[in-house]
Interface confidence: low
């Protein structure tokens, strides 16, 4: 949006579409440029030229807050925004008023204005910014602190969310979120946000407000989890009847209405969007909740948030499935409806949630709630392996350092001179409709960073704690994933985005990949064991993990994913005429299985799966695992090979072409 005077006057522009939607906890760069035809304005021969004055402000609800003012190379920042807003290119480029904002909070939504004054000239441009997403706390159905790191991530996924990052929890805390329950975050740390420190909730910060941390924890330890729900394209709605519904009846009613029971993540997003209902209803995980947006004493104790009905006064357990409540349904553009059996029928393994947003008050509850919600929950100090205040210090607040990236820094795909082997057919056979020149395999070496207990060791692969790190690229093209898309891509493939430590361990074990990829801490890196021209990066001719530092989340790269262990088996499927992608899906389903994800194939490879035949995977890619390299089978290195459509290692094969399949059950 730009507002300017006629052609010969000062003009300001923000070349971004409005509204600009950004994720909670992310950083945001808003470009703002001005053209000043007057250039130095001199008021009189004896006075110095006037410099342009830059002012950034945020306008919300008729109120304007000045974020910063800059002139003559000096920047003055509003004390409330110190360390949050900067002008990264000023004064190096005097006409560049680009603003960078760290750790976006929901409260940062609004209209941002870039205004430039020069003498009597004045011009401005505005941009609406919408911060998306909400952080919420999850608890398993049975009792508190029962989720290991893997189950914590799955708990979030099963409730239309992903595990939150430290930045997202920090942003939520700054927005007012507090919860005295330790929960996993995406970087494998355990934290909880406290505004009013009290007995049992001091953590590592004593009597100071802030996000408490236990540091990085072993993945087998159990806590609750903090999840992040980004947005939903559909709609949450209530259904009721004179008798209300049992859990099963509620599920049926939603189905009758062309919908299904909503997840907790969906209800949180609806609440964030203003949903208010003083009546408790069933959700997909068998929890009973209700969203309160307008505080009133007889409805959630004058508190806002998504309220939860518990079976026990200590905020554990869910109501009996035969008790009666409304149904909270969801209809919208999901990728796939959750099958009826998804959440099971109860018991210890059911992953579910505790979501009292502001505890500490005895709550009058709606109809059919007998136990009441308990008063403020506390951190239990009896965990066997550490005290409430462990020695691990909390890292400094997140900051962004963007190093200069030379044009040559981005690694290019190496020229593959060797002829691509063709493991997409049985030996000495060609695949109908697919000739040798049309498909190319990648020589990705994938290093195993763990081995499941009792699994066969992959020859030549080191045994390290952890799992398997692998490079992932969507079929379409190279460097196409934003930071958020990268995280989602790993999750979709049955893995999580790798941490710098995991990539470093993989590099030390011999992993090499000349492709820049996102990591968990929003840095972009790639591991090079044998430096060569297009893969020099920031390390000249020394081996090592190259890094571009922390990158803006809107930039696009590939991603490095990490898969830990396989809970099930990957098996190779074939038949004489082989399968189209669709037929492969159908065949796996007929075997009570699904097409394996890329992550599952990597995990199976790490446990010894070796197949010289490429097979369909769930994302439409074609890959094959090589444990024992042989000349006719993927070159001289172990790893998971990918068959690409184009020689530059991009493009998925035609889904109607015929290949084998890898199934998972």
């Amino acid at each position: 949006v730009e507002v300017s005077e006629p052609d010969n006057s000062l003009s300001v522009s923000i070349p971004e579409p409005s509204p600009l939607r950004v994720l909670l906890g992310s950083s945001l760069t808003i470009p703002c440029y001005f053209i000043d035809p007057m250039h130095p304005v001199t008021t009189a021969p004896s006075t110095a030229p006037l410099a342009p004055r830059i002012k950034w402000s945020r306008i919300s609800k008729e109120k304007e807050v000045v974020l910063l003012v800059a002139t003559e190379g000096r920047v003055r920042v509003n004390s409330a925004y110190q360390d949050k807003v900067t002008l990264p290119n000023y004064p190096a480029i005097p006409s560049d008023a680009t603003l960078e904002i760290q750790n976006m909070r929901s409260n940062d939504s609004g209209i941002l204005r870039c205004e430039v004054m020069h003498g009597i000239e004045d011009s401005q441009a505005t941009l609406e910014v919408v911060v998306k997403g909400i952080v919420f706390h999850y608890r398993a159905i049975s009792t508190r602190y029962t989720l290991d790191f893997d189950r914590a991530q799955r708990a979030c996924l099963q409730n239309s969310a992903i595990i939150a990052t430290p930045e997202q929890l920090q942003a939520a805390y700054e927005d007012g979120f507090h919860q005295c329950d330790a929960g996993w975050l995406a970087d494998q740390t355990v934290r909880y946000p406290i505004h009013t420190p009290r007995e049992g909730c001091y953590g590592d910060k004593d009597e100071f407000p802030g996000v408490r941390t236990y540091g990085i924890r072993d993945t087998n330890e159990t806590y609750d989890v903090y999840c992040f729900a980004e947005e939903m394209e559909g709609e949450v709605f209530y259904a009721t009847s004179p008798e209300k519904f049992t859990f099963q009846e509620a599920a049926n009613e939603c189905r009758r209405l062309g919908a299904r029971l909503a997840t907790t993540g969906q209800l949180y997003l609806a609440w964030q969007g203003g949903m208010d209902m003083c009546s408790a209803g069933w959700l997909a995980d068998r929890s009973v909740r209700y969203p309160i947006s307008k505080a009133r004493p007889n409805c959630g104790g004058n508190l806002l948030g998504v309220r939860t009905v518990y079976l026990h006064a200590n905020q554990t357990g869910y109501p009996d499935p035969s008790s009666r409540y409304d149904a909270i349904c969801y209809t919208g553009e999901d990728f796939v409806d959750i099958p009826e059996s998804f959440f099971g029928v109860g018991g210890e393994e059911d992953i579910t949630i505790q979501t009292v947003t502001w505890p500490d008050v005895e709550l009058p509850l709606p109809r059919n709630i007998t136990e009441g919600e308990a008063r403020g929950s506390v951190i239990l100090t009896a965990k066997p392996d550490f005290e409430v205040s462990p020695t691990a210090p909390e890292p400094e607040e997140p900051f962004t350092f963007v190093p200069e990236v030379r044009a040559t820094a981005f690694p290019e795909v190496e020229n593959r001179t060797e002829e691509a082997t063709r493991p997409w057919a049985f030996p000495r056979e060609s695949t109908p409709g697919l000739g040798a020149p049309t498909a190319f395999t990648s020589e990705d070496l994938v290093v195993q960073v763990t081995l499941a207990p009792g699994a066969a060791e992959v020859p030549g692969q080191p045994r390290l704690p952890g799992g398997v790190v692998f490079h992932y690229r969507p079929g379409s093209s190279r460097y196409s994933l934003t930071f958020e898309e990268a995280k989602q891509a790993c999750l979709r493939t049955g893995a999580i985005i790798a941490s710098p430590e995991q990539l470093q361990a993989a590099y030390e074990a011999g992993y090499e990949q000349c492709d820049a990829g996102w990591l968990q801490d929003q840095t972009v890196r790639y591991p090079i064991v044998s430096p060569r021209t297009p893969c020099v990066g920031d390390k000249d001719s020394s081996p090592g993990v190259r890094t571009y530092g922390v990158r803006p989340p809107s930039e696009t790269y590939d991603v490095y994913c990490y898969v830990d262990r396989l809970e099930g088996e990957v098996f190779f499927a074939t038949r004489l005429e082989q399968f189209t992608f669709w037929e492969a899906q159908e065949f796996c389903e007929s075997q009570n299985a699904t097409l394996a994800t890329t992550g599952q194939l990597y995990a199976a490879w790490s446990r010894g799966l070796d197949k010289c035949y490429a097979g369909w995977l769930a994302d439409g890619s074609l890959r094959y695992p090589i444990v024992t390299p042989r000349p006719a089978c993927g070159g001289d290195k172990p790893g998971v090979r990918t068959v690409y459509l184009y020689p530059n290692q991009t493009g998925l094969l035609d889904p109607l072409s015929r290949h084998h399949a890898f199934c998972f059950r």
């Epitope: 299904r260 209809t331 990728f335 796939v336 669709w582």
Partner: nanobody, 124 residues
């Protein structure tokens, strides 16, 4: 697998309406996402609309949003495409498809069963 038969195509003037039907035979119609695609002469098959197996979720291509409506009657094993404010550029063979996947940007490979198509011609 389900077998699909489209009907309801024909010649219509610009601005007019048509309602396409797709009758499915076979088991468990209600467990399939149903989609409509179209193919104009010399062009690739393009996505028009999809409806989830429950019927509660729909997606439309930008080119037909606000003009076309997809619906289904699981009791009758039928999916419909109501086409209003038709334009000459809507001229194509319209195909009905059934699949077990549902996503916001459907692709032909998601669908395992296809009808033989019905011709829609919009004259100016």
């Amino acid at each position: 697998e389900v077998q699909l038969v489209e009907s309801g195509g024909g010649l219509v003037q610009a601005g007019g309406s048509l309602r396409l039907s797709c009758a499915a035979s076979g088991r468990s119609f209600s467990s399939y996402a149903m989609g409509w695609f179209r193919q104009a002469p010399g062009k690739e098959r393009e996505f028009v609309s999809i409806i989830s197996w429950s019927g509660g979720s729909t997606v439309y291509a930008d080119s037909v949003k606000g003009r076309f409506t997809i619906s289904r009657d699981n009791a009758k094993n039928t999916v419909y495409l109501q086409m209003n404010s038709l334009k000459p550029e809507d001229t194509a063979i319209y195909y009905c498809a059934a699949g077990r996947l549902y996503r916001a940007t459907p692709r032909p490979a998601d669908f395992g069963s296809w009808g033989q198509g019905t011709q829609v011609t919009v004259s100016s």
